[in-house]
Interface confidence: medium
């Protein structure tokens, strides 16, 4: 089991360190944005921060988002789906409920 | 439930080194950073550095660069701390976190 | 020395407020980095109280509450009980260390 959840699209209006503006953080760098990281990373909360983390890749578990304001903040956040990928539930993955359903990046 | 079960009580002389460490369970191992924290008798927490469990990456404390080695056994869902030339102001309860949860902390003392 | 400072001591009688403050700087609480509170009781391992500078982890009494504004925090206990009695710590990220930072710590005492 993974309690990660996804990237919450929100952004801050603050100034970063010039240190980051020089160079993209890398897997793990403390973020403020998707933009402070590196090509393929994006900025997702870690619990004590939000840090650079991998976009997801195809058959990976993602957490499709329900209504904004629907749920508290998410401690642990995945990565959206990668391009050319959307976060949908796993067609051979049966669950008593919607809710619980494993979704996965698949293929447009 | 999340768990973090550290190694026992050491003692240590100065100039030592001391190796201790935090096993996980109740969570996919893999999935998340492992920081350690100090606390010397009667004082504040202190941040040492973190650990990818899955890439075994690191990050260290400016104050512990070239003196921590922090380590992973992703098989046995095992994190390490190691910290070398050991002063008589290590002495401190070390843990490590999952951020959210902590382990119970290993109490080091180093005296001559 | 730690950049982010609390009151050193905090003090109530049972059923009444108190705050403790975490004053930080632009490039700490003032850049936008999330501060977390922690609870530490004697002998035992932090306890996470707030987290994401409002939020309570379930389990946390709605006694307790946070705020943040500008370069600092702050962490409300309403209605004072003898079981608050322990250490506090706020907790962010700072960018100019390039690691993360704990409060100095405030020990809250419930009177008579």
């Known amino acids: 089991g993974n309690d990660h959840s996804t990237l919450d699209g929100y952004s801050r209006r603050t100034t970063l360190s010039s240190k980051m503006y020089h160079s993209k953080g890398q897997e793990g760098s403390v973020c403020l944005r998707s933009s402070d990281c590196a090509t393929g990373l994006c900025c997702a909360r870690h619990f004590w921060s939000k840090i650079c983390k991998p976009v997801l890749k195809e058959g990976q578990v993602c957490t499709k988002h329900r209504r904004k304001g629907s749920h508290g903040l998410e401690i642990f956040q995945r990565c959206y789906c990668g391009e050319g990928l959307s976060c949908r539930i796993q067609k051979d993955h049966h669950q008593a409920s919607n809710s619980s359903r494993l979704h996965t990046c698949q293929r447009h | 439930q999340v768990q973090l079960l550290q190694s026992a009580a050491e003692v240590k002389k100065p100039g030592e080194s001391l190796k201790i460490s935090c096993k996980g369970s109740?969570?996919?191992?893999?999935?998340?950073?492992l920081h350690w924290v100090r606390q010397a008798p009667g004082q504040g927490l202190e941040w040492m550095g973190w650990?990818?469990?899955?890439?075994?990456?690191?990050n260290y404390a400016q104050n512990f660069q070239g003196r921590v080695t922090m380590t992973r056994d992703t098989s046995i869902s095992a994190a390490y701390m190691e910290l070398s030339s050991l002063r008589s102001d290590d002495t401190a309860v070390y843990y490590c976190?999952?951020?959210?949860?902590w382990g119970r902390g290993t109490t080091v003392t180093v005296s001559s | 020395q730690s950049v982010l400072t609390q009151p050193p001591s905090a003090s109530g009688a049972p059923g009444q407020r108190v705050t403790i403050s975490c004053t930080g700087s632009s490039s700490n609480i003032g850049a936008g980095y999330d501060v977390h509170w922690y609870q530490q009781l004697p002998g035992a391992a932090p306890k996470l109280l707030i987290y994401?500078?409002?939020n309570r982890p379930s389990g946390v009494p709605d006694r307790f509450s946070g705020s943040k504004s500008g370069t600092s925090a702050s962490l409300a206990i309403t209605g004072l009980q003898a079981e608050d009695e322990a250490d506090y710590y706020c907790?962010?990220?700072?960018?100019?260390?390039?690691?993360?930072?704990f409060g100095t710590g405030t020990k809250v005492t419930v009177l008579g």
């Open positions: 109740g969570y996919d191992f893999p999935g998340y950073y």
């Open positions: 994401g500078n409002s």
């Open positions: 976190t999952r951020e959210d949860h």
């Open positions: 907790q962010s990220y700072d960018s100019s260390l390039s690691g993360y930072v």
């Open positions: 650990i990818n469990a899955n890439s075994g990456a690191t």
